[in-house]
């Protein structure tokens, strides 16, 4: 039975998800849509993604590992609207790792999820990036320019932002 196998598939997906996230918050996105769109309960949601601000201070590599354990990645920012949503939940006196790095120090920036790096959709502070040895990107607040990106040394502990796709149940 098609409906039965669909239900079984949905429940097993839910069980797998709840190994990492014991509680979900779900929203009805439209009147005729049967599925709920869900994020883990402490996470926030924007469009088709869920976001979590990790306040523990860790290196870029450990921050990415922390996100991946939760089924997420360090955040990949695709639009100005997405960044405007994210910054509502950040503290001005903190810096947060993004899922953006330049492993070879050659200014070949790459996103953790292989999204192509598009120079036209970047939000670097003026004068940044400015150091070939600073191979990881953060987002932080500067009074002159508000929120923007900066390159820093990857081993310096920072807070971070995780992003994952919503689950539909």
């Amino acid at each position: 039975n098609f409906m039965y196998s669909k239900t079984v598939k949905r429940l097993s997906k839910l069980r797998e998800y709840q190994q990492y996230h014991p509680s979900l918050t779900c929203v009805m996105e439209g009147k005729d849509i049967e599925d709920w769109s869900c994020c883990p309960t402490p996470w926030t949601s924007f469009q088709s993604s869920c976001y979590f601000i990790s306040t523990g201070m860790q290196s870029w590599t450990k921050s990415q590992k922390n996100c991946s354990v939760m089924g997420a990645d360090l955040v990949v920012i695709n639009t100005r609207e997405e960044q405007d949503f994210i910054i509502q939940n950040l503290k001005r006196n903190s810096s947060y790792f993004l899922g953006l790095s330049d492993p070879g120090g050659r200014r070949h920036w790459q996103w953790v999820d292989q999204t192509p790096y598009n120079e036209n959709v970047t939000f670097w502070h003026s004068g940044e990036p400015n150091n070939l040895d600073e191979r990881c990107a953060i987002i932080n607040f500067r009074s002159s320019e508000e929120w923007g990106w900066n390159d820093i040394h990857c081993h310096v502990p920072q807070k971070s932002i995780c992003k994952m796709k919503k689950i539909y149940i």
Epitope: S23, L24, C26, I33, W36, C38
Partner: nanobody, 123 residues
Framework: QVQLQESGGGLVQAGGSLRLSCAAS????????MGWFRQVLGKEREFVAA????????YYTASVKGRFTISRDNDKNTVYLQMTSLKAEDTAVYYC????????????????WGQGTQVTVSS
């Protein structure tokens, strides 16, 4: 026979808060999803929020997410709806509902209803 009894409604100013309670009698409560609906005179009853039997899944309609919080206490057979930042458009009769399943789809209809409690938000 399961009975659902709402309380906590009233008149509140826009921007204010209210907490609705729904006490359930009978054995349905602990293994059923529970929810809240609301109805404005002359309109159909609409879903507001629901909670799975063990509180692991919280369900909301988009217009209340971030303002309303649903919770339950299985020891007290009670489900709550904490409403904050209330708006004039939240004015309605609020109904407690019990489902015949532990989790729900957006299309799942409740099997039990309370009598309703009036919430009026003045602007």
């Amino acid at each position: 026979q399961v009975q659902l009894q709402e309380s906590g409604g009233g008149l509140v100013q826009a921007g204010g808060s209210l907490r609705l309670s729904c006490a359930a009698s009978g054995r349905i409560f602990s293994n059923s999803a529970m929810g809240w609906f609301r109805q404005v005179l002359g309109k159909e009853r609409e879903f507001v929020a629901a909670i799975s039997e063990n509180s692991s899944i919280l369900y909301y309609t988009a217009s209340v997410k971030g303002r309303f919080t649903i919770s339950r206490d299985n020891d007290k057979n009670t489900v709550y709806l904490q409403m904050t930042s209330l708006k004039a458009e939240d004015t309605a009769v609020y109904y407690c509902a019990g489902y015949g399943s532990t989790t729900i789809r957006t299309t799942t209809r409740p099997t039990k209803w309370g009598q309703g409690t009036q919430v009026t938000v003045s602007s």
